[in-house]
Interface confidence: low
Amino acid sequence: PRGTQAEESPFVGNPGNITGARGLTGTLRCQLQVQGEPPEVHWLRDGQILELADSTQTQVPLGEDEQDDWIVVSQLRITSLQLSDTGQYQCLVFLGHQTFVSQPGYVGLEGLPYFLEEPEDRTVAANTPFNLSCQAQGPPEPVDLLWLQDAVPLATAPGHGPQRSLHVPGLNKTSSFSCEAHNAKGVTTSRTATITVLPQQPRNLHLVSRQPTELEVAWTPGLSGIYPLTHCTLQAVLSDDGMGIQAGEPDPPEEPLTSQASVPPHQLRLGSLHPHTPYHIRVACTSSQGPSSWTHWLPVETPEGVPLGPPENISATRNGSQAFVHWQEPRAPLQGTLLGYRLAYQGQDTPEVLMDIGLRQEVTLELQGDGSVSNLTVCVAAYTAAGDGPWSLPVPLEAWRPGQAQPVHQLVKEPSTPAFSWPWW
């Protein structure tokens, strides 16, 4: 808005100038003398009315009549000066059909640099590149940055080195970084960021040997800067078909089995595992500064073992030319997938006969002759792909007597099993 030239400006005092640093509090004042009812004084910044101005208006009559002259003083308070407060300030009044504006006053910001962004604490792997950020502004501009590492400038002078982003090609020891912002008013120093150097992630995690209940693994340690590795930690978790882990989830789906390894050597035997079970394993190594990141989960599997115990509750009875043998699955761990049972029997002074029964837990043997072979004994063993488990103790073939309870399964005859003839009977 512009005042018209038709009438003399009512303003007798115009806003002054304020120049200061951020946070400064100041007041702009304008004064006018008007006849009749005092108008409301508006404040403009760069030509725009300030709707939410912190202004106070004082009105003093110069006579006793309302139509006499009035002195009107408006004060605009600027609290905590910011960049957004800078500009040209004027007072504006509407008198009748005319608009009047005062002469301008100026608010400027000038002081030490102000940080918009400062370097942050972080951890980095040894000898690994990273970036730090720092940003400052005036006015006055320009603002130059000087980066310092462990309080030593990284350039001969501000602005000669990197500016907003500092690229560090790698560290071998925990270091501090800060930046100084310089302008014509002086220097402001940022917070000091501590960059902690951790060991690099171990590499080449691999299996050295496998047993049904243990795995021996080895890895190559990463660089750890000037800090020797104190130990490495290995975690194993049941894969549960790898759900979650293979999908890249960072944490295992259940509480992992954790073991610590003294280093060197960078090798560890993980015991107390389940045979024939898929696991995922990972390793991290630690120095005095903290642990490295974990390696990716490596899928491994314990091999099958043989059953650890013989079949249970073996009973063998004979009725004429038939022998009935039955048993129950071993109570001891199978250490793998049960593929079946082997049965061996032998009479006194006769060679042993070995049979593969498959997965059934009973067999009916057709004996030739009258079955008069004496001291016939039977042994049973369970087997997996890894081999036979321990054989049961020999069970003598007992004659069946009327009234004796027959074993539940002994009447189930294996049709595909041929009758065995004993030529020496």
Partner: antibody
């Protein structure tokens, strides 16, 4: 207002040391800026000699590196130039100046001290 | 070291007329941060040098806007739009891109 006032002898004998003092008022030399020495030879040519930084570090012109030393006394807010083994080639007007921390742009200068090296 | 070359060595101007002084650097003074690290000083007779312009085109505090600086990475010009009597003296360009700081040989401005 920042002021730099120089003092020191105007005549030095060859092979001796040239020593000048720059006294600063209106700003602490340990609070910021670079505190420089510049010289102007009789033919008007200007040569930057070196600075002492607010943090106590130094930087010298390689052409003078073996002969120059810039020190300071923060309690007196003064900094000093010492140039060893002078010859007639070192005859010049010596200025101290405050360098901005914006690439050393020098905004305040001392009044200058004319030093003649002669036996 | 970066070599600064000024021309002409002297210039004679009528009061109220404009004057231009040239300066050339042996290497570009444009920094990757976008600033060009060239400044201009005026040394009035019997006085110490005073800063006129820094970073090629920024007017130092208290310097009248009759002075302006422009240029590219290696070629620079100081222009005085309406020369006044108080402008006489020797004008120096200098670079502060890197140490050692180096100066031009100076251009003497005289009034016709």
């Amino acid at each position: 207002q920042v002021q730099l006032v120089q003092s020191g002898p105007g005549l030095v004998k060859p092979s001796q040391s040239l020593s000048l003092t720059c006294s600063v008022t209106g700003f602490s030399i340990s609070s910021g800026y670079y505190w420089n020495w510049i010289r102007q030879f009789p033919g008007q040519k200007l040569e930057w000699m070196g600075y002492r930084s607010y943090d106590g570090s130094n930087n010298y012109n390689p052409s003078l590196k073996n002969r120059i030393s810039i020190t300071r006394d923060t309690s007196k807010n003064q900094f000093f130039l010492k140039l060893n083994s002078v010859t007639s080639e070192d005859t010049a007007t010596y200025y101290c100046a405050r360098g901005w921390l914006l690439h050393y742009t020098m905004d305040y200068w001392g009044q200058g001290t004319t030093v003649t090296v002669s036996s | 070291d970066i070599v600064m070359t000024q021309s002409p060595s002297s210039v004679s101007v009528t009061l109220g007329q404009s004057a231009s002084i040239s300066c050339r650097s042996s290497r570009s003074l444009l920094h990757s941060n976008g600033f060009t690290y060239l400044y201009w000083y005026l040394q009035k007779p019997g006085q110490s040098p005073q800063l006129l312009i820094y970073q090629m085109s920024n007017l130092a505090s208290g310097v009248p806007d009759r002075f302006s600086g422009s240029g590219s990475g290696t070629d620079f010009t100081l222009k005085i739009s309406r020369v006044e009597a108080e402008d006489v003296g020797v004008y120096y360009c200098g670079q502060n891109l890197e140490l050692p700081l180096t100066f031009g040989g100076g251009t003497k401005l005289e009034i016709k």
